[in-house]
């Protein structure tokens, strides 16, 4: 802290300009009048001035507004911003999508802070919604972004935002999410054809439940192994060996490098040895011949 | 994590002008500032100058007239140009950044080394 | 000349206690500006060890520790180790120069 001491003679801020990074800390915060320093923040970010003096700037505002900045000034802060507390982000009220990516420009190249993550709560709670702009904004920013929310919150996402969703931005996702994401990836890209649609849909496939997985396969879709790899087991599970392979199409012979992973493993144990032979990879593992198979899930079911 | 890589000449004629590049890896060039900080043989550490995310930059008084440091956001680099070197600028020279909200350098260049010689 | 100052070197053996001071005047460490430490072994670059004053980054031993008092601040290492024998740097910002200043360096001696 900064003590308070009388601004030395001759010494008293008029505006806010370079020849402020040669005041001595204490003469910062006895010189420097905060009501000046709001109405010309857009001038603090054209000044050198060091982490430190920052500080001292952060403190002369929190003095002039002690339940939280207008937008007017958060719109300005620039790297002012990296000086805030959660605490004091929680106070804020940022509406302005533009305020918004001036704040994230700051925090770029570096990891999502605690106060970058207040922030976005801030301002998605304040729209009430994750909108297309907001999502398209703050992938941008974090490609892994999305998958930072829980299932709750991803439910939020009208599935009009899902068009600004890149492959990339799902990586991190765990199949809930996905299971969450997938059927708004399905309303927005339905009127797609099918080569299109696959291409937009293939990285929330994660989320995919059987009977749409048996649809593409009817649609010579080429599935890559990555995609297939990603699938829910009690969604593989169901397929035929028919319907693998026309969903893989070229990418079949991949199976043999998986066969001892997850979902290919427990989807090779519930075929026919014979049907798996047809596709002539060496498969093995599935049932042998004259076996007669229980689902007895499906027992259950009707009972 | 972010890493740098400083390079240039390692041997520059008196009266001539040292030309070194700083190479930010694995991160953004658009931090707050970066710094140019060097280390004569034996002795201690002096701070260069340093550049802004905007392109302001501000130099150690006793080097002003001779230092220049400029970035290039395309190619996650800055640059600084000393002119007129003599023996006296022998030193290793180091990149430096700042610790995210603090004027403490906690990510450095390995350093290059240049020696100023006819 | 250095801005700030060091004293050229200290030792100590294995397991004591060493100080090394940081000495600057009312347009730096007086000014109310921050200290910084930083570690330098033999052919490497300087590590960051302590910050704003006392703070410790993540991976530095608690064996570190700093303070700051009016112009001067100082560096304190508890249970000397062979490994901590290097060069230490101390520094600040210096309002009169607009710029960082740092220490001449202090070599610490771990005595075997």
């Known amino acids: 802290e900064v003590e308070k001491t009388a601004c030395p003679s001759g010494k008293k801020a008029r505006e806010i300009d370079e020849s402020l990074i040669f005041y001595k800390k204490w003469e910062l915060e006895a010189c420097v009048d905060a009501a000046l320093l709001a109405t010309q923040m857009d001038r603090v970010n054209a000044i050198p001035f060091t982490y430190e003096q920052l500080d001292v700037l952060k403190h002369k505002l929190d003095e002039l507004y002690p339940q939280g900045y207008p937008e007017s000034v958060i719109q300005h802060l620039g790297y002012l911003f990296l000086k805030m507390s959660p605490e004091d982000i929680r106070k804020w009220n940022v509406t302005s999508l533009e305020t918004l990516k001036a704040l994230l420009e700051v925090n770029k190249g570096h990891e999502m802070s605690p106060q970058v993550a207040t922030l976005i709560d801030r301002f998605v709670k304040g729209r009430g919604q994750l909108d297309k702009d907001t999502l398209d904004t703050l992938t941008a920013f974090y490609p892994g972004y999305l998958c930072s929310l829980s299932p709750e919150e991803l439910s939020s996402v009208p599935p009009s935002s899902i068009w600004a969703v890149r492959p990339q931005d799902l990586d991190t996702c765990d199949p809930r999410q996905l299971d969450v994401l997938y059927p708004k990836a399905r309303l927005a890209f339905q009127n797609m054809n099918g080569s299109e649609y696959f291409v937009k849909i293939q990285s929330f496939l994660g989320g995919a439940p059987t009977e749409d997985l048996k649809a593409l396969s009817q649609q010579n879709v080429s599935m890559d192994l990555a995609t297939f790899m990603k699938l829910r087991t009690d969604a593989v599970l169901p397929l035929t060996v028919a319907e693998v392979q026309k969903l893989l199409g070229p990418h079949v012979e991949g199976l043999k490098a998986e066969e001892r992973h997850r979902p290919v493993r427990d989807w090779i144990l519930r075929q026919r040895q014979d049907d798996l032979d047809t596709l002539g990879l060496g498969l093995q593992g599935g049932i042998p011949n004259g076996y007669l198979v229980l689902d007895l899930s499906m027992q259950e079911a009707l009972s | 994590q972010v890493q740098l890589q400083e390079s240039g000449p390692g041997l520059v004629k008196p009266s001539e002008t040292l030309s070194l590049t700083c190479t930010v890896s694995g991160g953004s060039i658009s931090s707050y500032y970066w710094n140019w900080i060097r280390q004569p043989p034996g002795k201690g550490l002096e701070w260069i100058g340093r550049i802004y995310y905007n392109g302001n930059t501000y130099y150690n008084p006793s080097l002003k007239s001779r230092v220049t440091i400029s970035g290039d956001t395309s190619k996650n680099q800055f640059s600084l140009k000393l002119s007129s070197v003599t023996a006296a600028d022998t030193a290793v020279y180091y990149c430096a950044r700042p610790k995210l909200g603090i004027d403490a350098f906690d990510i450095w260049g390995q350093g290059t080394m240049v020696t100023v010689s006819s | 000349q250095s801005v700030l100052t060091q004293p050229p070197s200290v030792s100590g053996a294995p397991g004591q206690r060493v100080t090394i001071s940081c000495t600057g005047s009312s347009s730096n460490i007086g000014a109310g500006y921050d200290v910084h430490w930083y570690q330098q072994l033999p052919g490497t670059a300087p590590k960051l060890l302590i910050y704003g004053n006392s703070n410790r980054p993540s991976g530095v031993p608690d064996r570190f520790s700093g303070s700051k008092s009016g112009t001067s601040a100082s560096l304190a290492i508890t249970g000397l180790q062979a490994e901590d024998e290097a060069d230490y740097y101390c520094?600040?910002?210096?309002?009169?120069?607009?710029?960082?200043?740092f220490g001449g360096g202090t070599k610490l001696t771990v005595l075997s």
């Open positions: 520094q600040s910002y210096d309002s009169s120069l607009s710029g960082w200043v």
